[in-house]
């Protein structure tokens, strides 16, 4: 009977118990982007550092070719921050001349790709107009939320303009996910 | 045999099971900073409320002298928001006179200190140029991500200008961490 | 003895073990808001999609009438992003005429309502001055943190101006919570 004493109650064990330390997890950090061919009508995807410095993947969560590969179905918390930097946006210069115009903008999208589904799914989007008055500018966009993912799903981070991404420090631009 | 029925499967028990409710967790909230001596060449660290209102520390996660002390090795989700407020940035005044200049900025860094390691490690940084056109301005910087921490590590939040932090409400400026 | 081998150690079982997959969780997404009566001196609450597209509620976490209902006491991670969009703020026009003035602003508040307590509690606030120089503008405010909640607590998201919320895409404006 002693063995039963510490077993989880009958009510709780329909879903299997599992140790937290063996759950799929990843934190990826920015690397300098090399010019690549982008898909037409789709924001370019960032590629990432997955093992040096603060970056890691563990427990079957793998990174390959700009994608985080989901090894197990479940609810995941997914997050990313992208820090952008640029020179004066043309938007403000044009506006100063008295002509209204569409503002410049910066956008981050966390996208899910499911092989059995033809179109990628946009999970999270952060988008911001940038109409700075002169000088250099820099700012982060942060995103994070929980999603139900299936084994084999792939996650990537797309940005509106890859050349504006601040790739200088691993703490400024990053991407991660963990099974809850 | 009955005792074995609900025991986790052999595959799952190499890492010990543990109840979620006993994991180290903390949510700290802003208090007014009093002028102090800052370390040279390092952004000043904020100090925090750890037990009143919405703030708490639990399960051996302790707060002391501006630091959250990590009581157990593992993967932690760490987050902070700092709301800044200020008057017109000098930057915009200079720019209006037609001279380009380096913008004012606001920065938040979540830093890890490991006693056995000489240099602090910057885990997360949010940095934003502030070139407001006149009037008062206010805005938050939010950060959050997962990191592998070791027992004894210490976490702090550093800011570029402590006097611009909005200390008025516990929901505007905060810092937290929890073991996954 | 075999049954005991994989049972959690004595130290770990005072808090009941439970499967992660059966914890209360929700991710709600934006829907177009219909004009409603707002409480005086309180920002209006958003209502949400809870089952279509990326939205879901599970394990007794229910959504009803703008509220997420907490079904079980514990520590929850709560998050929201609201994307705002608008035309040129009056603030900048007045300022250009040389008169200083109070800036326009956008604010998101995640609020907890406890039936036994007369006043709602503001858990999280993101507030930002908006003084754009001409043109349209758009930008997100993101919030997320951990709180100790009680069974029966209700969560809502309030915004300073419901008419500025971008309701066009489920990835731009969302609200979620999950038991840790």
């Amino acid at each position: 009977l002693k063995g039963q004493e510490f077993a989880p109650s009958h009510q709780q064990v329909y879903a299997p118990l599992r140790a937290d330390g063996d759950k799929p997890r990843a934190h990826l950090t920015v690397v300098r982007q090399t010019p690549t061919q982008h898909f037409k009508n789709q924001f370019p995807a960032l590629h990432w550092e997955h093992e040096l410095g603060l970056a890691f993947t563990k427990n079957r969560m793998n990174y390959t070719n700009k994608f985080l590969l989901i090894p197990e179905s479940g609810d995941y918390f997914i997050y990313s921050q992208v820090t952008f930097r640029g020179m004066t946006s043309e938007c403000s210069e044009i506006r100063q001349a008295g002509r209204p115009n569409k503002p410049d903008s910066i956008t981050v999208v966390i996208t899910k790709v499911t092989d059995s589904y033809p179109e990628p799914t946009q999970l999270l989007m952060g988008t911001k107009s940038v109409c700075e008055v002169g000088s250099n500018w820099f700012q982060p966009i942060y995103l994070g939320a929980m999603f139900s993912l299936q084994e084999g799903d792939k996650l990537m981070v797309n940005v509106s303009d890859i050349s504006l991404v601040d790739y200088t420090k691993e703490d400024k631009t990053f991407f991660g996910a963990f099974l809850l | 045999l009955k005792g074995q029925e609900f025991a986790p499967s052999h595959q799952q028990v190499y890492a010990p099971l543990r109840a979620d409710g006993d994991k180290p967790r903390a949510h700290l909230t802003v208090v007014r900073q009093t002028p102090t001596q800052h370390f040279k060449n390092q952004f000043p660290a904020l100090h925090w409320e750890h037990e009143l209102g919405l703030a708490f520390t639990k399960n051996r996660m302790n707060y002391t002298n501006k630091f959250l002390l990590i009581p157990e090795s593992g993967d932690y989700f760490i987050y902070s928001q700092v709301t800044f407020r200020g008057m017109t940035s000098e930057c915009s005044e200079i720019r209006q006179a037609g001279r380009p200049n380096k913008p004012d900025s606001i920065t938040v860094v979540i830093t890890k200190v490991t006693d056995s390691y000489p240099e602090p490690t910057q885990l997360l940084m949010g940095t934003k140029s502030v070139c407001e056109v006149g009037s008062n301005w206010f805005q938050p910087i939010y950060l959050g991500a997962m990191f592998s921490l070791q027992e004894g590590d210490k976490l702090m939040v550093n800011v570029s200008d402590i006097s611009l932090v909005d200390y008025t409400k516990e929901d505007k400026t905060f810092f937290g961490a929890f073991l996954l | 003895l075999k049954g005991q081998e994989f049972a959690p150690s004595h130290q770990q079982v005072y808090a009941p073990l439970r499967a992660d997959g059966d914890k209360p969780r929700a991710h709600l997404t934006v829907v177009r808001q219909t004009p409603t009566q707002h409480f005086k001196n309180q920002f209006p609450a958003l209502h949400w999609e809870h089952e279509l597209g990326l939205a879901f509620t599970k394990n007794r976490m229910n959504y009803t009438n703008k509220f997420l209902l907490i079904p079980e006491s514990g520590d929850y991670f709560i998050y929201s992003q609201v994307t705002f969009r608008g035309m040129t703020s009056e603030c900048s026009e007045i300022r250009q005429a040389g008169r200083p003035n109070k800036p326009d602003s956008i604010t998101v508040v995640i609020t907890k309502v406890t039936d036994s307590y007369p006043e709602p509690t503001q858990l999280l606030m993101g507030t930002k001055s908006v003084c754009e120089v001409g043109s349209n503008w758009f930008q997100p405010i993101y919030l997320g943190a951990m709180f100790s909640l009680q069974e029966g607590d209700k969560l809502m998201v309030n915004v300073s101006d419901i008419s500025l919320v971008d309701y066009t895409k489920e990835d731009k404006t969302f609200f979620g919570a999950f038991l840790l």
Epitope: - | R32, T36, M87 | -
Partner: antibody
Framework: QVQLVQSGAEVKKPGASVRVSCKAS????????MHWVRQAPGQGLEWMGW????????NYAQKFQGRVTVTRDTSISTAYMELSRLRSDDTAVYYC???????????WGQGTMVTVSS | DIVMTQSPSSLSASVGDRVTITCRAS??????LNWYQQSPGKAPKILIY???RLQSGVPSRFSGSGSGTDFTLAISSLQPEDFATYYC?????????FGPGTKVDIK
Amino acid sequence: QVQLVQSGAEVKKPGASVRVSCKASGYTFTGYYMHWVRQAPGQGLEWMGWINPNSGGTNYAQKFQGRVTVTRDTSISTAYMELSRLRSDDTAVYYCTSGGSFDAFDIWGQGTMVTVSS
Amino acid sequence: DIVMTQSPSSLSASVGDRVTITCRASQSISSFLNWYQQSPGKAPKILIYGASRLQSGVPSRFSGSGSGTDFTLAISSLQPEDFATYYCQQGDSTPFTFGPGTKVDIK
């Protein structure tokens, strides 16, 4: 400990200028705004302006614009307030004050009495 | 400029009394309201910041409330050292402005 020490009392003639110094110690001088507040005899408190010791940027109350100049010397952690074209109603105790945020005042100097009299 | 008004301008009370002082701003100042105590011949001392938050080291008998335009300072049980002048100050926008003060003296 954290303190602000001001220069001594001054007696000035109308039309003259006065310069009051404020030496900070026990904290990082460049990390916190320094303000000047005055109090006429038997009257309330009146904010004059601030300096950001880090950047040197200033902000003055309109009432004193053109007459007041606040400066600092970071090498000796000292702020200065100069008020020109003195009038008899400038007779007051002048305080330097700083705080953990730019909009409130935790630490105060002991005050400097400036008397303007012909 | 934001104009701050206080009432009453003076009050007489006894040790142990509960005292309340009100402060009103001419326009909304959110929670950017601070309270100071000044004893004769001394520099002011901050008591309450952010309208309702007690400055470290200040006795808990002092409390503040309010937001927007209307604010209150309360002293739950007056002590001999509390007889002084109390000022409110707005930190919402420059020029920062103080109320005219409320003098609390012994009845």
